[in-house]
């Protein structure tokens, strides 16, 4: 899915109102020094691509994130504010249903959610390289058409 035409401001509002708090709850009890972010993103569509991948694609050692509250709210926000996103997720939903039902918080999952928090930070405030536009919103606005 190409996230270029999503309504980024609406997704940001959804993240800040609820998703961010669910991520903090998931990470509660984890030391803030524990994980170093290794996944990065360069602009808002790229950030959403990485966020989708880490949230919904099972990885070795962490197969259950898609059933977490923050994941369900992320999916809802993308479905509402990214035109055509829902249609691309039918197969992914089937795969999700086949994933194991129990929610197990492993260290690998905690690390993955720490990465997600970092990706969301960059989504909320993209930091473009200096040689590019010094105005991070202009970079988005060139491609960005609001869909309500």
């Amino acid at each position: 899915y190409d996230f270029t035409n999503c309504d980024f401001e609406k997704i940001k509002a959804a993240y800040l109102s609820t998703i961010s708090k669910d991520l903090i709850t998931y990470m509660s009890g984890t030391k803030s020094t524990e994980f170093n972010n290794t996944v990065s993103c360069s602009n808002r569509p790229h950030c959403l691509t990485e966020i989708q991948s880490l949230t919904f694609n099972p990885t070795a050692g962490c197969a259950s994130l898609a059933k977490e509250m923050f994941a369900m709210k992320t999916k809802a926000a993308l479905a509402i504010w990214c035109p055509g996103y829902s249609e691309t997720q039918i197969n992914a939903t089937q795969a999700m249903k086949k994933a194991r039902k129990s929610k197990v918080t492993t260290n690998k999952c905690l690390e993955q959610v720490s990465q997600l928090q970092g990706l969301w930070r960059r989504f909320n405030r993209p930091l473009l390289k200096q040689q590019g536009s010094s105005d991070y919103k202009d970079d988005d606005d060139k491609h960005h058409h609001h869909h309500h």
Partner: antibody, heavy 119, light 107 residues
Amino acid sequence: EVQLVQSGAEVKKPGSSVKVSCKASGYAFSNYLIEWVRQAPGQGLEWIGVIDPGNGDTNYNENFKGRATLTADKSTSTAYMELSSLRSEDTAVYYCAREDNTGTAFDYWGQGTTVTVSS
Amino acid sequence: SIVMTQSPDSLAVSLGERATINCKASQSVSSDVTWYQQKPGQSPKLLIYYVSNHYTGVPDRFSGSGSGTDFTLTISSLQAEDVAVYYCQQHHRFPLTFGQGTKLEIK
């Protein structure tokens, strides 16, 4: 506990340079942007620029471009702000600050470093 | 650059009364506004982010509202420890910019 500890006060001559350090502790240094802000005596806050310690990416206020240089040393969890070609109007308290967990604010600030430029 | 203009420059309010500080952006900043409190000789402290979200530990008497170009910080019942300078900031576009500050005193 998250802490940002800055280097001590500096007195500099016009035309010289100053390098202020900001040592971070209590969190994963590479994961959060470090912002630099200054405050002239009796004045408001002015944003200088920002660095991503994870990859060295920066963004500067045009007012400081060419004079301010932001760097970060991951091995010591320390960010630096160097300002060159100093003039009297650069006399100010310089602050480093960390972005918050959502990327939309500065939640932890250093104690500030007073830089005085005087001949 | 986006100019953030606060009003009033200074404000004197009686203890227990409501204090209201306004911030106007020279162009729309969506909801990308933060409020900070700075007491004499101290570093700024985060109060409110993304217009209306309380930072951890900030008392409920502080609240933020607005969108687009007009924003407000309200202290519902002024306490002695609220004497400070308050700054709004936009992070919608680089360069990030602050308002000039509003000095809040006890009447």
